[in-house]
């Protein structure tokens, strides 16, 4: 019985002349992957990754298809003709064959740059807004604490008791209050043996992810 599922990068877009990583991942099965085939829209072969024989790249694509990362494939020097469906076929033992689909849209450089011109300031503004909100919340929290401590101070002033000030200590461990936790530029180990353009491409890809994750702000607030 085939219990596994293929997870793919789904619908992706990339710039003409640029590169893109096609990734499929087989999960929910203990089956052994013996071979992965990569095919193009018209079902013509792009590459094969055999567990024992390594990679076979279709000769016509040898200069612009790079094996990896992992069982994935990196398409370089993209043209408009590269737009379309891509299929990964996993041969496994004992399950049999699994198949995944990815749709790649190659955008004209001008279109991509045009959308980027609007996107970057927008993302920048959003990030700035989040930073401002973070700071505002910190200020409110600090002021509230100060007010509270002043009240306590005035009530206990007759007793001449000194405040420990512990509540105002900022935990230094994970990150300072209000800091926006950024994702790592590239997951550890992913570029271990992968070097050169592919790896640079990976870093670019994950830098985009980390840029998008700027919105996750962590606050250290009192509980109780």
């Amino acid at each position: 019985m085939m219990t596994g599922t293929i997870e793919t990068t789904g619908n992706i877009s990339a710039k003409k002349g640029g590169s893109v990583i096609l990734q499929c991942h087989l999960s929910s099965t203990m089956a052994q992957v013996t071979q992965v085939n990569w095919e193009q829209h018209d079902h013509s072969l792009l590459a094969i990754r055999n567990a024992e024989l390594g990679w076979h790249i279709y000769p016509a694509f040898k200069d612009r298809v790079a094996p990896g990362p992992g069982l994935g494939l990196t398409l370089q020097s993209l043209t408009m003709n590269d737009t379309g469906e891509y299929f990964c076929t996993y041969h496994t033992y004992p399950d049999g064959t699994y198949r995944g689909r990815i749709f790649l849209e190659v955008l004209e450089s001008s279109v991509a740059e045009h959308s980027a011109r609007f996107q970057i300031p927008l993302l920048g503004a959003m990030a700035m807004m989040l930073v401002v909100i973070c700071i505002a919340v910190i200020v409110v929290v600090v002021l509230a604490r100060k007010k509270k401590s002043l009240r306590i101070h005035s009530v206990e002033s007759g007793l001449q008791r000194k405040s420990t000030g512990q509540e105002e200590q900022i935990p230094s461990a994970p990150s300072p209050p209000g800091s926006c936790v950024q994702a790592e530029a590239a997951p550890a180990g992913l570029c271990g043996e992968q070097q050169g353009d592919d790896c640079a491409e990976l870093h670019d890809y994950f830098n985009v992810l980390s840029y998008r994750s700027l919105g996750s702000c962590s606050f250290f607030t009192e509980t109780g």
């Epitope: 013996t34 071979q35 072969l45 094969i48 055999n50 567990a51 024992e52 024989l53 390594g54 076979h56 790249i57 279709y58 000769p59 016509a60 040898k62 200069d63 041969h91 033992y93 064959t97």
Partner: antibody
Amino acid sequence: QVQLVQSGAEVKKPGASVKVSCKASGYTFTRYSMYWVRQAPGQGLEWIAFIDAYSGGSTYAQKFQGKATLTVDTSISTAYMELSRLRSDDTAVYYCARGGDYGWYLGVWGQGTLVTVSS
Amino acid sequence: DIQMTQSPSSLSASVGDRVTITCRPSENIYTYLSWYQQKPGKAPKLLIYNAKSLPSGVPSRFSGSGSGTDFTLTISSLQPEDFATYYCQHHYGNPLTFGQGTKVEIK
């Protein structure tokens, strides 16, 4: 048209080494892998190894690991196979063959090189 | 290792006959099988790849079929130049292995 021309016959003594060459023409050398197969007199075909002419990486049959060494010189579109520690049972015709477009099969073959190991 | 068992090891046939050679791998190789023809004193020549695909220049009387662990090479109408030895080969793992060969002789 695609052509693979191999070096001439060799006679070697046991324990010696031999280097067979395979000159390719009629296609872009670095786009294909080069395979080596041998055939002992009156016997069937036996795969030895292949080399990716683009990266220079080789894959060997376990039996020939440490026995055969594959190299390429892309500047002259030539593949080489060196066999070391020759024994009499290494006497065979050695073929180079260009890999196929769609996988690890052998699309075009050289004419073969007879290597005779005899004391 | 994947063992390739070819049958028959030899056969006698006449010009015009339909000839069938089978190849049985010891395990599932999907459609990763090729067929070669070798004439005495000559290098082998590719006839079929990926179980059923014909390279350009190979006559259409040659055809391949099968998948998994059962494959067939068929010569629909045997010609004088077809008398030779035929080998199957899997291309699904290391080592790549060949069948022991089938010699097609004139009856």
